[in-house]
């Protein structure tokens, strides 16, 4: 399980990739088959890893979700899958793109009109800790004074990139998800080889601005496959 | 409103075994990662493990890793310590608390490794 | 590991007066990925901070966070009686997490 993977000592250490996600000290570059991630500034991977592409939504990209490929498949087995759009069947809001919400089984739009008299605890309480500033999330104590808070900033928990302020997304650090710094120009960033390859990123990376694509580095073609360093780049 | 309420402290003798309880209420207590913290009598916060929201994930302080499980029941809305091997400098309060930056806490337990 | 190191150890000032606590950190945080605790006697710690220089929910407009690198600071503008505690940093930016060792805000 990912969790024995995690827990393992059983790992080689590798030298820190050039540079970091926005600086980020631990942002490991994946390199599938295997696992990045940080121990400490140690860098670490886990060979030919393959039977559990994903455990948990977070592992996923922001227009992903964790779930079997089938269904009634092996719960065991679970890849990223594209998040369902508004209208489509859900069991939980990861399962439903950005800028919707899973309510009552079907993904619904959470822009702000949605929650004017309508605020359900489902909401609330997943998202409404006041101090991460969720936009629109609002315990029911609070609506008189406080309908909306503004968004995440950089290190604030959240849930999924729309409850991060402009230029930042949620990415997974540790055990929780906190807003990050998009990536910019020129900064190393994360290519994911085949879709549910992600693998454990425990430092996971923001995905690249507008008008930038992860793309290999021009210097790194001669690199190994696993080695290849990428990088934001304008299309 | 948000509660984190821990239990199993007590006395127990080097070597032995404890479980402490992490109680929580308030919030959708599957979206959130979790966090253990101890604070040994007089001196300052060390922070000893956590765990993901689903539980896939767990993180351990190198003082107590292969001694310390850290798990939860999401049906449960419970965190757990497993702890074994304890030693006399495991003595502490045990706090709970919730996510990365440790928003919400919980009153503290009292473990005593003593013989 | 990234240490922190706290400072002063012990502030005495009175009420009404501003506090300026420092915490150092032993390599670059990159990313403000700080927070800044209050405890008191017999309680748990509260937060007060994170992400350098946010406020946590309920925190007076008296209490901010500021800085970058390896130098930050909590400022509290003007003391009231239920400042007086232990303040702690701590650094969610790198494996493993850990806090400074405190800086104790008494009155004078």
């Known amino acids: 399980t990912l969790n024995s993977v995690l827990n393992s000592n059983a790992i080689k250490n590798l030298p820190p990739p050039l540079g970091g996600a926005a600086g980020h000290p631990g942002s490991a570059v994946s390199a599938a088959p295997g696992i990045l991630y940080p121990g400490g500034n140690k860098y670490q991977t886990i060979d030919n890893y393959q039977p559990y592409p994903c455990a948990e939504d977070e592992e996923c990209g922001t227009d992903e979700y964790c779930a079997s490929p089938t269904r009634g498949g092996d719960a065991g087995v679970q890849i990223c899958l594209a998040c369902r759009k508004r209208r489509k069947r859900c069991m939980r809001h990861a399962m439903c793109c950005p800028g919707n919400y899973c309510k009552n089984g079907i993904c619904v739009s959470s822009d702000q009109n949605n929650f004017r008299g309508e605020i359900e605890e489902t909401i609330t309480e997943s998202f409404g800790n006041d101090h991460s500033t969720l936009d629109g999330y609002s315990r029911r104590t609070t609506l008189s004074s406080k309908m909306y808070h503004s968004k995440g900033q950089e290190g604030s928990v959240c849930l999924r990139s729309s409850d991060c302020a402009t230029g930042l997304c949620c990415a997974r650090h540790f055990w929780s998800k906190i807003c990050k710094p998009v990536l910019k120009e020129g900064q190393v960033c994360t290519k994911h080889r085949r879709k549910g390859s992600h693998g454990l990123e425990i430092f996971q990376r923001c995905y690249c601005g507008e008008g930038l694509s992860c793309r290999i580095q021009k210097d790194h073609h001669q690199a190994s496959n696993s080695s290849r360093l990428h990088t934001c780049q304008r299309h | 409103q948000v509660q984190l309420v821990e239990s199993g402290g007590g006395l127990v003798q080097p070597g032995g075994s404890l479980r402490l309880s992490c109680a929580a209420s308030g919030f959708t207590f599957n979206n959130y990662g979790m966090t253990w913290v101890r604070q040994a009598p007089g001196k300052g916060l060390e922070w000893v493990s956590g765990?993901?929201?689903?539980?896939?994930?767990?993180y351990y302080a190198d003082s107590v890793k292969g001694r310390f499980t850290i798990s939860r029941d999401n049906s449960k809305n419970t965190l757990y310590l497993q702890m074994n091997s304890l030693r006399a400098e495991d003595t502490a309060v045990y706090y709970c608390?919730?996510?990365?930056?440790?928003?919400?806490w919980g009153q503290g337990t009292l473990v005593t490794v003593s013989s | 590991d990234i240490v922190l190191t706290q400072s002063p150890a012990t502030l005495s000032l009175s009420p009404g007066e501003r506090a300026t606590l420092s915490c150092r950190a032993s390599?670059?945080?990159?990313?403000?990925?700080l927070a800044w605790y209050q405890q008191k006697p017999g309680q748990a710690p509260r937060l007060l901070i994170y992400?350098?220089?946010n406020r946590a929910t309920g925190v007076p407009a008296r209490f901010s966070g500021s800085g970058s690198g390896t130098d930050f600071t909590l400022t509290i503008s003007s003391l009231e009686p239920e400042d007086f505690a232990t303040y702690y940093c701590?650094?969610?930016?790198?494996?493993?997490?850990?806090f400074g060792q405190g800086t104790k805000v008494e009155i004078k």
């Open positions: 701590q650094q969610y930016g790198d494996e493993p997490i850990t």
């Open positions: 992400g350098a220089s």
């Open positions: 608390a919730r996510t990365i930056y440790m928003d919400y």
């Open positions: 390599q670059n945080l990159f990313s403000p990925y």
């Open positions: 765990i993901s929201g689903s539980g896939s994930y767990t």
